[in-house]
């Protein structure tokens, strides 16, 4: 099954793909496409390299690494929910049935909602403690403005403190939400 990678709406997504050139600069054609790897090439090609250079790309898709050293990892800029799905990295290695084909699943999550700035001071003043979360790397860590992130183990305590309080009403009125997971 496909390896899964995650990013949030508005962020850049990173899909890793590597090979080792037989010699420095001795490159092989690589394609990236949306959809699982088919028999020929890639489906719905978004980027392609040849033995010398990137010879085709579409907006928002680029190679951030040094592809001349075999780092053909794909960066997708400013992702939206529509970018979710399977991506194919195909490395067309010389020889009989030698192609390396990787299907990578990209999951895009909605961006966390930031409360209105006018209410931010109230919230941080009421809860000055430092709360942190750990995600699966930079793409998973998102801070709500200058607000502290909320550890999942502290959700129930925080909910109890908010219940029936004026702050809860203020927070609701401002349209802010707390997303879990």
């Amino acid at each position: 099954s496909e390896v899964e990678y995650r990013a949030e709406v508005g962020q850049n997504a990173y899909l890793p793909c590597f090979y080792t050139p037989a010699a420095p600069g001795n490159l092989v054609p690589v394609c990236w496409g949306k959809g699982a790897c088919p028999v020929f090439e890639c489906g719905n090609v978004v980027l392609r390299t040849d033995e010398r250079d990137v010879n085709y790309w579409t907006s928002r898709y680029w190679l951030n690494g040094d592809f001349r050293k075999g780092d053909v990892s794909l960066t997708i800029e400013n992702v939206t929910l529509a970018d979710s799905g399977i991506y194919c990295c195909r490395i067309q290695i010389p020889g009989i049935m030698n192609d390396e084909k990787f299907n990578l699943k990209l999951v895009i999550k909605p961006a966390k909602v930031t409360p209105a700035p006018t209410r931010q001071r109230d919230f941080t003043a009421a809860f000055p403690r430092m709360l942190t979360t750990r995600g699966h790397g930079p793409a998973e860590t998102q801070t709500l403005g200058s607000l502290p992130d909320i550890n999942l183990t502290q959700i129930s305590t925080l909910a109890n403190e908010l219940r029936d309080s004026r702050l809860a009403n203020d927070l609701r009125d401002s349209g802010a939400t707390i997303r879990i997971g």
Partner: antibody, heavy 120, light 107 residues
Framework: QVQLQESGPGLVKPSQTLSLTCTVS??????????WSWIRQHPGKGLEWIGY???????YYNPSLKSRVTISVDTSKNQFYLKLSSVTAADTAVYYC????????????WGQGTLVTVSS | EIVLTQSPATLSLSPGERATLSCRAS??????LAWYQQKPGQAPRLLIY???NRATGIPARFSGSGSGTDFTLTISSLEPEDFAVYYC?????????FGQGTKVEIK
């Protein structure tokens, strides 16, 4: 406009090797995006993909024929080749060379086909 | 290998009529399905690729639809030159395989 032309003997004896040449004109065999392929069609029947070679040197063979088939290329002559060893009557077919263009709007180019009969 | 089953085996229609051809795959081929047309004594010609995209130079009366395992080729109004054998072909999994063909003949 890419054009392809098959050539080779129309009659091969059982247990021998079938050898065909495809000559490409109107395009370079070393260009990216073209999958240079061999496909065959048994008399009155459906189509069977034998294999392809890509300009990178990537080669794929149909598993049902893999132990007997070789596809190669000579870029200086702009030709690619099919060899099928240990043939039997079941290999009697029209053999097509074809090119599938997969960059941009997909298109294909085929030779007119050559009938190869395996018989003693 | 993926088996493609086409139906009907033969379709008898008159010029100007609509033709609907079906292709079913033994497992999902996503949208990686093509349709070819073959006339007697000629090589096949690619009509549709990736289920619904017309190949270069193919008239608009040819259209394809479907995904996964069930696909349809529609010829909206048959022209005399459309009477031929039609094959579906998958490129999802190696080796690429073809259906057994549907013959569209003049009624």
């Amino acid at each position: 406009q890419v054009q392809l032309q098959e050539s080779g003997p129309g009659l091969v004896k059982p247990s021998q090797t079938l050898s065909l040449t495809c000559t490409v004109s109107g395009g370079s065999i070393s260009s990216g995006g073209y999958y240079w392929s061999w496909i065959r069609q048994h008399p009155g029947k459906g189509l069977e993909w034998i294999g392809y070679i890509y300009y990178s040197g990537s080669i794929y063979y149909n598993p049902s024929l893999k132990s007997r088939v070789t596809i190669s290329v000579d870029t200086s002559k702009n030709q690619f080749y099919l060899k099928l060893s240990s043939v039997t009557a079941a290999d009697t077919a029209v053999y097509y060379c074809a090119s599938l263009m997969v960059w941009g709007v997909m298109g294909d180019y085929w030779g007119q086909g050559t009938l190869v009969t395996v018989s003693s | 290998e993926i088996v493609l089953t086409q139906s009907p085996a033969t379709l008898s229609l008159s010029p100007g009529e609509r033709a609907t051809l079906s292709c079913r795959a033994s497992q999902s081929v996503s949208s990686y399905l093509a349709w070819y047309q073959q006339k007697p004594g000629q090589a096949p010609r690619l009509l549709i690729y990736d289920a619904s995209n017309r190949a270069t130079g193919i008239p608009a009366r040819f259209s394809g639809s479907g995904s996964g395992t069930d696909f349809t080729l529609t010829i909206s109004s048959l022209e005399p030159e459309d009477f031929a054998v039609y094959y579906c072909q998958q490129r999802s999994d190696w080796p690429p395989t073809f259906g057994q063909g549907t013959k569209v003949e003049i009624k």
